[in-house]
Interface confidence: medium
């Protein structure tokens, strides 16, 4: 309902005749619509790396031994089932929570085919009421299952080896003309059974299998290395309409919570009642002169507050996202109303402390003003909770709307999707996926690091055993100190007989310095869990320091960061071990072993078992790790 | 760079208005809040208000409540506050600072001070 | 509204020293606590928002910690620079309040 705010025609009643009931518009507009919808977009990139790092060109290796690619769209049956009802032939109730996932049952129905995601560039996968007793339900005398699975294999399978492009996967609720707040709450049912992305890249081994259209873990006997990936929200939580913001004039059932609840019977005081603005009038609610209140008092609905002394009573938005600097709480309140109350705005970020919001008022017309507070762009997910506390014997409070508005900018925001990956061991142990090909073996039977390991581009997992992996020295004169790769030979380092990248600081006699460079690495994916890790050890007396440097080609330019440094060591001779974390890493970029050295100094560096985790380029976090420096 | 000028030292009689300036550069000056704060021996800084230059909503502290008129020129980008019936109490330095909406908690640059001085 | 209680109020300390100041609300505010350096002459500078995060161009000397009701400020290797009068202001609740301020000066 508006008051002197250009909200738009609502349905209310008209100035005679008998009062119409309000009606949702049957059918949602198209950006309505989409905001209904769960979109998965797996970014290009991704496809990439995935390719450049597991899939060799088909040509290298025989069709047996070839990856092989799954996918499949998952989600929990039991808030959809809530949403049919009791339906026949359920053998555990749509109330009770579904079975465990480890053991849960799925039926899987059939995703889309390669030829319509090649034509529209996206898969629209569309959940009616049909699809969900299908999936979930299944013929009459069959058990319930707790998974609804929608098979992705070919197209995913199809994306990965000759896609371009990011993959894009939108599940929305069917459209059909049926009753008001259908889609809605369709909408919210398939976000609460928290949709997720299933991908599955697995080395084959002895034999081919036909690719079952579940996805459990392939046996032994035919896989070598199985890599598991999730794509879901980070915050299922959030509603749908935080995609293009929330305008609330109680005219028709809102995605608000109030405290203490909502009362639509007349009889109960002290608590939030939704009344008509026609009521309102023969109550006398409202003050101005009574001709002027039937003409001017807002049409539709608004919220009536009658509180008893010293009380507080809360409006809780639903979770929201903000993209955009301009977010704003807008409420209408009536101001003649609650002499002795105030109105305190709160923002309730997630996993954050409440913090109160500056309402700046606006006199609206007729006794009505706008109170209006900037929220502009948290970093997280977020509810605005609006909270009215009375201060004397009694008061009235009125709200006309609550809209939360301009907090999309550009594109929508939505909600962030994380993508986890995982390895999966031969005995069935899932490790994150930086455990694989670390130089430490997580599996019982080491397989990860094995094969695939062996397999990564050249640098990507260095042991020096074949030489020296892309590192690479400037031309040097015979008499330059240079960098080797060898075996520690020396009764003490019995434990370590392999290869190393070693330099030998002995007998100069003035100041020298030595670099070694790797080979180029790829920009990471943005906002992924990217590290580095090397073993290194410096042996007797270093008069000097031992630098890592990452330089990122940016735009042509280089630009050299250090990440790691030890300076005049005394050392123990024990292999040390690291993980740096490569933060903010945006171009592609190699790494620079550079030690300088004076005289006297008598050490040997050395450097092993270096690798760069695989979630650099194969996962993606939901939010982003660098913190913006915002104050 | 990023700049608040603030106007210079003024010297009123008891009882007349004022209207400090404060202009800023080197950034969207409707994408910030704009607040006052006053700095006295006795009572250290207090916070008087904020204007939102992009709507022209204001808030106050209802210490000042009558006190200061806040006021924005989105065009010469410049944030004004008028203190009136002034008093010898009036009589500190005032600083504007800006407010990132969200980074709402704190003040991340501020004006140099404008001094004034109630004196008959 | 919220009282920030400020200790010491001034102090002395050597080039080099590490020096804490500290800062109660009168009510948990949840981290909302900022730190905020004032120059002789007149100049104020936000150093720490939000508890403990640094605001750009602000020397990794300052550090900022603390939850609830109890917060500090600590400058770990003193510089002639700091000579300055150092102010918290909890921006939890509204209106914004601040601490009474600790005026540091080099012995």
């Known amino acids: 309902v508006g008051s002197g705010m250009g909200t738009g025609q609502r349905a209310g009643s008209p100035a005679a005749g008998p009062p119409l009931q309000p009606r949702e518009p049957l059918s949602y507009s198209r950006l309505q619509r989409k905001s209904l919808a769960v979109d998965f977009v797996v970014p290009s990139l991704f496809r990439v790396y995935a390719r450049d790092l597991l899939l060799p060109p088909s040509s290298s290796e025989l069709k047996a031994g070839r990856p092989e690619a799954r996918g499949s769209l998952a989600l929990d049956c039991a808030p959809l089932l809530r949403l049919l009802g009791p339906a026949p032939g359920v053998s555990w109730t749509a109330g009770s929570p579904a079975p465990a996932e480890a053991r849960t049952l799925s039926r899987v129905l059939k995703g889309g085919s390669v030829r319509k995601l090649r034509r529209a560039k996206q898969l629209v996968l569309e959940l009616g009421e049909e699809a969900i007793l299908e999936g979930c339900v299944g013929p009459p005398g069959e058990a319930a299952v707790g998974l609804l699975q929608f098979n992705l294999s070919e197209l995913f399978s199809w994306w990965i080896r000759q896609g371009e492009g990011r993959l894009r996967i939108r599940l929305m609720p069917e459209k059909k003309a049926s009753e008001v707040g259908r889609e809605g709450r369709l909408s919210a049912a398939i976000r609460a059974s928290q949709p997720r992305l299933l991908f599955q890249i697995f080395g084959t081994g002895h034999s081919s299998l036909e690719s079952p259209t579940n996805m459990p873990s392939p046996s032994p006997d035919y896989f070598t290395w199985n890599l598991t990936w999730i794509m879901k929200d980070s915050f299922p939580f959030l509603s749908h309409r935080s995609r293009y913001g929330l305008e609330c004039s109680f005219d028709f059932p809102c995605e608000l919570e109030y405290s203490p609840p909502l009362h639509d019977l007349r009889n109960q005081s002290w608590s939030w009642r939704r009344i008509p603005s026609e009521e309102a009038s023969q109550m006398d609610l409202l003050d101005g002169p009574g001709a002027e209140r039937s003409k001017e008092m807002p049409r539709g609905s608004f919220l009536l507050l009658n509180t008893s002394a010293d009380s507080k009573h809360t409006i809780l938005s639903p979770w929201m996202r903000s993209s955009s600097e301009h977010c704003t709480l807008a409420v209408s309140v009536h101001r003649h109303l609650q002499p002795s109350g105030r109105y305190i705005a709160q923002l309730l970020p997630h996993n954050e402390a409440a913090r109160e919001i500056l309402l700046m008022p606006t006199p609206g017309k007729h006794g009505w003003t706008v109170l209006q507070g900037r929220i502009g762009r948290p970093d997280n997910p977020f509810r605005v909770a609006l909270e009215y506390i009375s201060s004397g014997n009694r008061s009235l409070s009125a709200v006309d709307f609550f809209a939360l508005k301009n907090c999309s900018e550009g594109t929508s925001p939505g909600s962030k999707m994380a993508l986890q990956s995982s390895f999966t061991c031969w005995n069935g142990t899932v490790l994150q996926l930086g455990q694989a090909c670390d130089f430490h073996q997580d599996c019982a039977q080491g397989e990860d690091e094995s094969q695939m390991c062996r397999k990564l581009p050249v640098g990507f997992y260095c042991n020096f055993e074949d030489g020296f992996c892309g590192w690479t020295q400037g031309t040097l004169s015979p008499h330059t100190p240079q960098w080797q790769v060898r075996t520690l030979k020396d009764a003490r380092f019995q434990d370590h007989q392999d290869h190393a990248l070693l330099l030998s600081t002995t007998d100069v006699p003035a100041s020298e310095s030595a670099t070694v460079t790797s080979a180029t690495f790829p920009a990471p994916i943005k906002s992924s869990p990217c590290e580095l890790r090397m073993s290194w050890l410096i042996r007797g007396v270093l008069r000097g320091n031992v630098s890592l440097v990452l330089v990122e080609n940016k735009t042509g330019k280089e630009q050299g960061r250090m990440v790691w440094h030890v300076a005049a060591y005394e050392g123990l001779s024990l292999w040390q071990w690291m993980v740096l974390p490569l933060l903010d890493v945006s171009d592609r970029f190699w790494l620079q072993m550079v030690a300088w050295w004076g005289q006297g100094s008598r050490a040997i560096v050395a450097f092993d078992n270096i690798s760069i985790s695989l979630d650099c380029y194969l996962t993606i976090s939901g939010e982003d790790k660098i913190l913006q420096n915002t104050a | 760079a990023l700049q608040l000028q603030q106007s210079g030292a003024e010297l009123v009689r008891p009882g007349a208005s004022v209207t400090l300036s404060c202009k800023a550069s080197?950034?969207?000056?409707?994408?910030?809040?704009m607040h006052w704060v006053k700095q006295t021996p006795v009572h250290g800084l207090e916070w008087i208000g904020a204007i939102d230059p992009e709507t022209g909503g204001t808030a106050y502290n209802q210490k000042f409540e009558g006190k200061a008129i806040l006021t924005a020129d989105k065009s010469s980008s410049t944030a004004y506050m008028e203190l009136r019936s002034l008093t010898s109490e009036d009589s500190p330095v005032y600083y504007c600072?800006?407010?990132?909406?969200?980074?709402?908690?704190?003040?991340?640059?501020w004006g140099q001070g404008t001094t004034l001085t109630v004196s008959s | 509204d919220v009282q920030m209680i400020q200790t010491p109020s001034s102090l002395s300390a050597s080039l080099g020293d590490r020096v804490t100041i500290s800062c109660r609300a009168s009510q948990d505010i949840g981290n909302y606590l900022n730190w905020y350096q004032q120059k002789p002459d007149g100049t104020v500078k936000l150093l720490i928002y939000y508890t403990s995060r640094l605001h750009s161009g602000v020397p990794s000397r300052f550090s900022g910690s603390g939850s609830g009701t109890e917060y500090s400020l600590t400058i770990s290797n003193l510089e002639q620079e700091d000579i300055a009068t150092y102010f918290c202001?909890?921006?939890?609740?509204?209106?914004?309040?601040f601490g009474g301020g600790t005026k540091l000066e080099i012995n």
């Open positions: 080197g950034y969207t000056f409707t994408d910030y809040e």
């Open positions: 600072a800006r407010r990132r909406y969200y980074g709402s908690s704190s003040f991340d640059y």
């Open positions: 202001q909890q921006g939890s609740a509204l209106p914004p309040t």
